[in-house]
Interface confidence: medium
């Protein structure tokens, strides 16, 4: 048994550039030839335990065999040289691992950053994958002095072991080396102070101003290498519920500062702020954002009065009427604070007025049949809104002027209403709507529109396949005009049930069918037409179409003494629904006819 190998493969540590050719040789020792009665022609080459085809093998002399590989692509191959001892037993002589890859590319995009409080970190693009063990070394020097090399663990970045010296330029480059070659990046020359990324500003606080409801004052603490650097700031803000940030113009925060007043904000609104900083020259890197801080602007008086309307309950036989004044709570954007109460002033003549302070959104008062003026203002802790004024005319006054060409239509899942204004200047419009139902009262919702509006959508939560009665009333300085109403659907559906048909009169050859209109709760849309299907037990089905305004129809040309089956369907724009089937029999003889 030989302890030493029978021979060797050269090169012993082969590294090949991908796509190139490669030749290895196996040299057998003389002692091995004699021991096993072999020569180089007995050598079998294998890659990863598979025999190499003979055409790739050359016997150079009695001790030496070569193998050639073309276009090497596998990253790692186990190459072994084996002999057929005594001409038949395969025995391993030697083995090597053949690696393939690429020489390193020249590193590019070398950049360095000094994170405040840490050493300098440089990063680069190593280029294409080498598939080989490749060492990247970050080199740095002053004009007169070299700094310790930085050996990269990841091949794309390295943090130097020394603290940077500011206000002195440094030269930095990267060297890359593997078994196939060595290359250097372009060097970069810079002052580390121009590569600083400050720590984020901290202790950001937000305070409001009682004097100005449109501002918030920010203050914060900046680091800037312990005051060594002057920093400029970048401030962003958003309302509490928004997802996008609003940018304070950078030119407003260019000078070093630790406080700032943000203007043009909405009253009584919560804002969230964040801030970051950079060297005031703009060189270096922006810090990460600070922790967010929030603050709420101070209240301002409500920016407009509430929508204001009234409903009258006539009191017959009495000297006064009950009037329900109603208004809408202001949206936050107009309330500008917490609404404490509403002030209603009712005036019957210049000398008689009554003031009410109301916390809710309605007030019922008793008025005589005279003309009244009602004014309404909303109040928060800063002050009162302007007043909305309504004239409540005498019930004996007939309302003149109404809107014309009133239309309603669904679009984009909203119910739109449009009209042509009356010929007299309008103060505002009131839209009222409710679901028409035979099972429940029409509970009205309402909204107010400015005088300039003649197209809007209903702003309540509307239901599909419900019939809405919509009323539009123009309001003038002298009081409400005439009201115009129509019916509309947000979205129609097929009726919930079809009509129940019956016979009103049956003759020998004709029958008068009658039916009731489908209740509005089951219509689910505008009934456009009906179809009447009728047949005998053996005959073909006949269908007639009837306009939706009808509630009866005469079937003619019927056979006498015959059983007929009838069914009706009602159709909306979205489809139809059959009612129950009904049967009747025509008589054998007409009235007064004898067999």
């Amino acid at each position: 048994q030989l302890l030493e190998p029978c021979g060797y493969i050269y090169p012993e540590f082969p590294v090949v550039q991908r796509g190139s050719n490669f030749t290895a040789i196996c040299v057998l020792k003389e002692a091995c030839l004699q021991h096993y009665y072999v020569n180089a022609s007995y050598i079998v080459w294998k890659t990863n335990h598979a025999a190499v085809p003979r055409e790739q093998v050359t016997v150079i002399n009695r001790t030496t065999s070569s193998v050639t590989f073309t276009d090497v692509v596998l990253p790692s191959v186990q190459l072994t040289c084996n002999i057929l001892s005594f001409g038949q037993i395969e025995q391993n002589v030697y083995g090597v691992t053949m690696l393939s890859g690429f020489p390193p590319d020249k590193p590019t995009n070398l950049t360095c950053i000094v994170n405040e409080g840490k050493n300098m970190l440089c990063q680069w693009d190593p280029g294409r994958e080498t598939y080989l063990e490749t060492n990247y070394t970050l080199k740095s020097e002053w004009a007169t002095e070299k700094f310790p090399d930085c050996q990269s663990k990841h091949g794309t970045s390295c943090m130097v072991s020394y603290m940077p010296t500011y206000y002195v330029n440094i030269e930095v480059w990267v060297e890359a080396e593997n078994a196939l070659g060595k290359v250097s990046s372009e060097s970069i020359n810079f002052d580390p102070v121009d590569k600083v990324k400050p720590t984020p500003p901290y202790n950001l606080s937000v305070t409001n101003s009682e004097e100005l409801s449109s501002i918030l004052k920010l203050s914060w603490v900046s680091s800037g290498l312990g005051g060594l650097l002057d920093l400029k700031s970048d401030i962003q803000y958003r309302t509490k519920d928004a997802s996008t940030w609003i940018q304070v113009p950078l030119e407003d925060t260019m000078s070093p500062r630790t406080s700032f007043t943000v203007q043009d904000l909405k009253p009584f609104t919560e804002y969230v702020f964040r801030i970051r900083s950079i060297k005031d020259s703009g060189k270096g890197y922006w810090s990460d954002w600070s922790e967010e801080a929030s603050g709420t602007t101070y209240e301002d008086r409500p920016s407009r009065p509430p929508s204001f309307w009234y409903k009258t309950n006539p009191s017959h036989g009495q000297e006064y009427r009950s009037v329900r004044l109603i208004w809408k709570a202001l949206p936050l954007s107009e309330a500008n604070g917490k609404i404490l109460d509403y002030e209603v002033i009712l005036t019957q003549s210049k000398s008689v007025s009554q003031t009410y302070t109301v916390t809710g959104t309605e007030l019922t008062v008793n008025l005589t049949n005279d003309r009244y003026v009602a004014s309404l203002a909303a109040r928060n802790k800063v002050g009162k809104s302007a007043a909305a004024v309504l004239t409540i005319p005498s019930p004996h006054v007939t309302a003149a002027y109404s809107v014309v060409n009133l239309k309603a239509f669904p679009k984009d899942n909203l119910l739109w209403v449009e009209w042509t204004p009356p010929p007299k200047p309008v103060s505002k419009y009131i839209l009222e709507w409710c679901v028409l139902s035979e099972n429940a009262p029409c509970v009205e919702d309402w909204q107010q529109e400015d005088a300039t509006v003649n197209r809007t959508h209903l702003r309540g939560r509307l239901l599909e396949s419900k019939c809405y009665q919509i009323t539009v009333t123009p309001v003038f300085a002298t009081g409400p005009g005439g009201s115009e109403s129509l019916k509309a659907y947000l979205k129609q559906a097929a009726p919930a049930r079809g009509p129940t048909v019956r016979t009103k009169k049956v003759g020998k050859n004709e029958a008068v069918l009658a039916w009731d209109q489908i209740p509005v709760d089951d219509q689910n849309g505008f009934i456009r037409n009906y179809s009447i299907s009728y047949r005998t037990s053996v005959g073909k089905e006949m269908v007639v179409h009837v306009d939706s305004s009808h509630t009866e129809y005469t079937l003619s040309s019927l056979s006498s003494d015959t059983l007929y089956m009838v069914r009706m369907a009602a159709y909306t724009d979205e489809g139809g629904k059959d009612g129950p089937e009904f049967t009747f029999t025509t008589p054998k003889f007409a009235q007064g006819e004898i067999e």
Epitope: V352, N366, L367
Partner: nanobody, 125 residues
Framework: QVQLQESGGGPVQAGGSLRLSCVIS????????MGWFRQVPGKEREGVAA????????VYADSVKGRFTISQDSSKNTVYLEMNGLKLEDTGMYYC??????????????????WGQGTQVTVSS
């Protein structure tokens, strides 16, 4: 329930003064006008003066203008009638009343829903 309680009536010499008070309690509805009315036996109850509790506006019968003053103290839910220069024809039962109706006709008794029991004023020579 609503209760109105008058006080301050009594005998007085012609040309003298009296101050009537009316306390209202149990009023869940916001009253609009408080009024003073008087009635002489055999005659209809007539309006003397009224005050709007919210606006403070006042109305007087022609016969008392310049002599009588109506006022209120909302913190005490009380209405007062200050009567100066009393005349013999001012004698009668004085009633306090509350109305929920806003109107310049506020001494029209038909508009008042709530009434007190009355306090007697007697003017003698």
């Amino acid at each position: 329930q609503v209760q109105l309680q008058e006080s301050g009536g009594g005998p007085v010499q012609a040309g003298g003064s009296l101050r009537l008070s009316c306390v209202i309690s149990g009023f869940t509805y916001r009253q609009t006008f408080m009024g003073w009315f008087r009635q002489v036996p055999g005659k209809e109850r007539e309006g003397v003066a009224a005050i709007s509790t919210g606006g403070g506006s006042t109305v007087y019968a022609d016969s008392v203008k310049g002599r009588f003053t109506i006022s209120q103290d909302s913190s005490k839910n009380t209405v007062y009638l200050e009567m100066n220069g009393l005349k013999l024809e001012d004698t009668g039962m004085y009633y306090c009343a509350a109305s929920t109706v806003i109107t310049s006709e506020s001494i029209n008794r038909g508009l008042y829903q709530y009434w007190g029991q009355g306090t007697q004023v007697t003017v003698s020579s």
